[in-house]
């Protein structure tokens, strides 16, 4: 019928499974005169054929691994063989079947890991390839540890990322691996295709030999140091140690301070070399580096944090020698006259910098004392008694005591009584005419001078003029600065002018006083003026349609997936070339013509989401001007992290002998995202042999109870393996170990004879 299998010449895409013998035609193209025949070109591989009447078919089975997409072109020709229509692109997408098995790149892998390495941090990758399509289950590989040798107390010390083949330590491995006890391990790893979820999946195995090495290179706890210490310096504050002797230690000041008051000796001891001043710097972050004899770093630097503790060593300070406020004669009681804001350099929001205000003297005391009051904590001055008379007392001076818990400071305030504000500002011109400027005129340029006058008392808030642009500049591109002596207004450029969005602006100014007008007086047309700003065009950089572009994709999208796109336009209409900047993880590429962004590597939400990169739009031709925007890729979670224990459960104990069956509660977590309802873990014992002694019961989605089934336990440590399943898609399972000690107790705590202090359990049940 017309439509599905036949129709006119137009771009089309067809999907055909690989490995299938041809069973039907692909499409019948219909010719429109003068076209009489068709021609097929492109990646035909002698498989795709078009007959003269337009019948497109293939003559043998396709192989996706040879070519996943056949880009063909079909043209309609007239009787002379001249193209009269097309050529149009015809895309044949070859759909995958699972006809390839995964294979490891090596039959044996070797690696090493330091004890106490961070759980989940890969130290070795096994890698398998499968020629099938990674965007389908056929090419989706699932890695698993088949066996760990030796397996001590049934505890897995190693884990593998099912998707990436990254091998890392489990929490137990990080805590318990000890080269003195066991310096080497062997893992057998399997890889399956079909995401590991099908009975029909193909698989392969490999062997991994792992050497465990010791690690004592760890960042020390943050240090607190009181400022202005009077103890003799240098003072040792903390220490670091490299795993082997002979390391050369140094400190790196990442902030490049003019004065760096820390040092390290060749034992790795870190010192503060002089008293610290919190008001100069309240915290230091620097790095300890261990290098070999050739000056090459032996490992990552350790971050050292020093917090400087405040003491009350600063008095309050006044904002200026004299703070001047104005008050109109007719001001009402309670009106705010102004706020005195004193400062204290000690730590904010502490008692050391909390200030009180108090008026200690008013001069003159006419017509009486106590005309003003100050809010104790805010410093706001108010008129406390009758309205003031300028002819009686034109000026008052207040002495105000500002205090913190240890210091007092006197600040001085001058209050000028001024005339009532009954005159409005009047512009000397109502129209300042036209002004033509190029759109790249510098920010800060003065482009126009305006002038209004006010007949109120000179040099007071009643005659001072503030100019505002009230119309024609909604973008806030212009501003007006006032000369306080002459009330002249200088119109300046605050933001770039733009020919493309505002070629002509009709600007209206309003002249106002900072002091309120008296009742009954209002601003009228005399206080307004206008002018016309004409902006001329200059070649400008491209403009993105958004400051920040945001896109959302699942973290497991196939490489090559379009994850977003950005758009920019050049104000002058030039073509634009897009590029990426700051793609630190190498996850993305951008089509420089369309702005479409594609993934070029596996994405990982747990590595950080959103992933932020910059996109650059550059003019093609012209001046090659460019501009930058942000692209934020929000990664949606897939279930790719197995459950684990939420915290360290070493130190669990029961007092021996057990008088009655006991229980303890533990919590599980994983690194995947759990929206709305949170995780829904299920819990079971890790091996059948544990079922005689222990029982696990679920409390909720994250917590479970481990209970003893009887009271007949030996006085020793038991390691209980627990299987936690996250019920995700696909479901992932973690096997964790809870070490539980049965010990003799003294006053509810484990009793250990002297000399057996290692690993004392600290939590009693």
């Amino acid at each position: 019928q017309e439509g599905k299998f036949s129709g006119p010449l137009k771009p089309m895409t067809f999907s055909i499974y690989e490995g299938q013998e041809p069973s039907q035609i692909i499409f019948q193209f219909k010719a429109n005169p003068p076209a009489v025949t068709f021609e097929l070109t492109g990646e035909t591989d002698n498989i795709f054929v078009i007959e003269r009447e337009g019948l497109l078919y293939y003559n043998r089975a396709l192989d996706r691994e040879t070519r996943s997409t056949h880009n063909l072109q079909v043209a309609a020709l007239d009787a002379n063989g001249i193209i009269v229509e097309g050529p149009v692109p015809i895309t044949i997408k070859v759909k995958d079947i699972n006809d390839n098995r995964p294979t490891f790149l090596q039959s044996k892998y070797e690696g090493s890991v330091r004890q106490n390495s961070r759980p989940g941090k890969p130290f070795l990758y096994v890698n398998a390839t499968d020629l099938d399509d990674p965007a389908t289950p056929n090419g989706q590989l699932y890695y698993q540890i088949v066996i760990q040798l030796p397996m001590i107390n049934n505890v897995m010390y190693f884990q593998i990322n099912n998707k990436t083949g990254a091998i890392s330590l489990t929490r137990e491995g990080s805590q318990e691996l000890n080269p003195a006890k066991n310096p080497s391990y062997n893992l057998v790893i399997s890889v399956k295709d079909m995401g590991g979820q099908s009975e029909n999946s193909f698989s392969d195995t490999t062997s991994v030999d792992i050497i465990v090495t010791e690690n004592i290179w760890k960042a020390p706890k943050p240090v607190e140091m009181v400022e202005n210490s009077t103890d003799p310096h240098p003072i040792k504050i903390t220490q670091v140690r490299w795993n082997d002797p002979g390391a050369q230690y140094s400190l790196v000041d990442k902030e490049k301070l003019p004065r760096f008051p820390f040092s390290i000796d060749q034992e790795g001891d870190i010192y503060v070399t002089q008293p610290l001043d919190r008001e100069e710097k309240d915290a230091y972050v620097f790095y300890a580096v261990a290098k070999d004899e050739y000056g090459k770093p032996l490992s990552y630097p350790l971050e050292i944090h020093v917090k400087v503790k405040d003491i009350n060593d600063n008095p309050p300070t006044c904002p200026s020698p004299v703070t001047v406020f104005e008050v109109q004669e007719n001001e009402r009681l309670g009106n705010s006259i102004g706020t005195l804001t004193a400062h204290d350099r000690d730590e904010e929001n502490t008692a050391n910098s909390f200030l009180n205000y108090r008026i200690v003297e008013q001069t003159p005391k006419l017509p009486m004392d106590g005309l003003f009051l100050i809010q104790t904590y805010a410093g706001m001055l108010q008129l406390a008694k009758q309205s003031l008379k300028k002819q009686d007392t034109p000026q008052y001076n207040l002495t105000i005591e500002v205090s913190d818990k240890d210091f007092k400071t006197l600040c001085f305030v001058q209050i000028n009584v001024i005339d009532i504000n009954d005159q409005i500002p009047i512009f000397e011109k109502s129209d300042y005419g036209n002004l033509t400027l190029a759109e790249d005129t510098n920010i800060g340029s003065t482009i126009l001078t305006i002038q209004a006058t006010d007949a109120d008392e000179p040099f007071t808030g009643s005659s001072k003029i503030l100019y505002h642009i009230i119309k024609g500049d909604s973008e806030g591109r212009l501003g007006v600065d006032t000369d306080p002596h002459t009330n002249t207004g200088y119109v300046i450029i605050k933001k770039p002018l733009d020919f493309e969005t505002a070629a002509v602006s009709n600007i209206v100014f309003k002249a106002e006083n900072p002091e309120p007008l008296v009742f009954g007086v209002k601003y009228n047309a005399s206080s307004f003026a206008k002018f016309t700003l004409i902006v001329t065009d200059v070649n400008e950089a491209p403009q993105f349609s958004q400051h920040v572009f945001q896109a959302k994709v699942s973290e497991d999208v196939a490489i090559g997936t379009k994850v977003g796109n950005v758009t920019a336009k050049d104000p002058e209409g030039l073509d634009i070339s897009y590029s990426l900047r700051g793609d630190t993880r190498g996850w993305l590429k951008i089509d420089h013509v369309t702005g479409e962004i594609f993934s070029v590597a596996p994405l990982d939400r747990e590595a950080g989401s959103p992933y932020r990169v910059q996109v650059v739009a550059t003019e093609v031709g012209g001046s090659s001007l460019s501009s930058v925007s942000e692209f934020h890729l929000i990664l949606m979670d897939v279930n790719d992290n197995p459950p684990r224990l939420a915290k360290d459960y070493t130190g669990l104990f029961f007092c021996h002998p057990l008088s009655a069956p006991g229980s303890l509660i533990f919590e599980a977590t994983d690194d995947d995202q759990h929206l709305f309802r949170g995780p829904h873990f299920t819990f079971s014992l890790g091996s059948g042999s544990l079922q005689n002694d222990w029982e696990v019961s679920k409390i909720n989605g994250t917590h479970a109870r481990l209970s003893t089934r009887h009271t007949e336990f030996e006085e020793r440590e038991y390691v209980v393996l627990i299987r936690i399943n996250d019920g995700g898609r696909p479901p992932l399972e973690g096997i964790v170990s809870l070490p539980v000690t049965f010990c003799s107790c003294v006053e509810g705590s484990c009793f250990r004879p002297a000399g057996h202090q290692t690993g004392i359990p600290t939590v009693g049940m």
Partner: antibody
Framework: QVQLQQSDAELVKPGASVKISCKVS????????IHWMKQRPEQGLEWIGY????????KYNEKFKGKATLTADKSSSTAYMQLNSLTSEDSAVYFC????????????????WGQGTTLTVSS | DIVMTQSQKFMSTTVGDRVSITCKAS??????VVWYQQRPGQSPKLLIY???NRYTGVPDRFTGSGSGTDFTLTITNIQSEDLADYFC?????????FGGGTKLEIK
Amino acid sequence: QVQLQQSDAELVKPGASVKISCKVSGYTFTDHTIHWMKQRPEQGLEWIGYIYPRDAITKYNEKFKGKATLTADKSSSTAYMQLNSLTSEDSAVYFCARWGYYFGSTSYYFDFWGQGTTLTVSS
Amino acid sequence: DIVMTQSQKFMSTTVGDRVSITCKASQNVGTGVVWYQQRPGQSPKLLIYSPSNRYTGVPDRFTGSGSGTDFTLTITNIQSEDLADYFCQQYSTYPWTFGGGTKLEIK
């Protein structure tokens, strides 16, 4: 062997019409297009148009639309060109030629020509 | 319409010589150009197509070159039977057009 045999010379009066024939042999008439060209003394060739005998599809040079009409008779493997409203400007030698292209080939050229028919328009 | 210009109407040469006949298109015609030879009183005959392929039976003294807008027919070791008109033709765009011809005269 391929041959294109054109009709003999014609002497006609202004305002009259004439029909020139081009009989082909040696190949399948419906596989190739037949084109007509005009040549005046000491001048180049002008392309008049073509006919595709299989579907009777025609295409004309705008300049000759209304002047020339191309037809074909599959049964006799003959192509015709009728010229009407003749004037002295139409006096010329007219050639038919076979265009070499057929489905699946790359023969983009006139490979065989008729011997030419001389038309004289005179009162 | 695309104009095919053969700027030399006549070219005089001697036996054994070499000559180049040029043809310029008024716009890009790619490789859609053919050269024909027309001896006095005869029909045109195909020489070169696309635009550097020699037709069956054409002596290798005849060669063609060019693409886009500039095309050349070169005849080496000229023989007396080469006395003829030489035409270029484009089939890139309808209406198809011919050059005005270049008459080769032998001294």
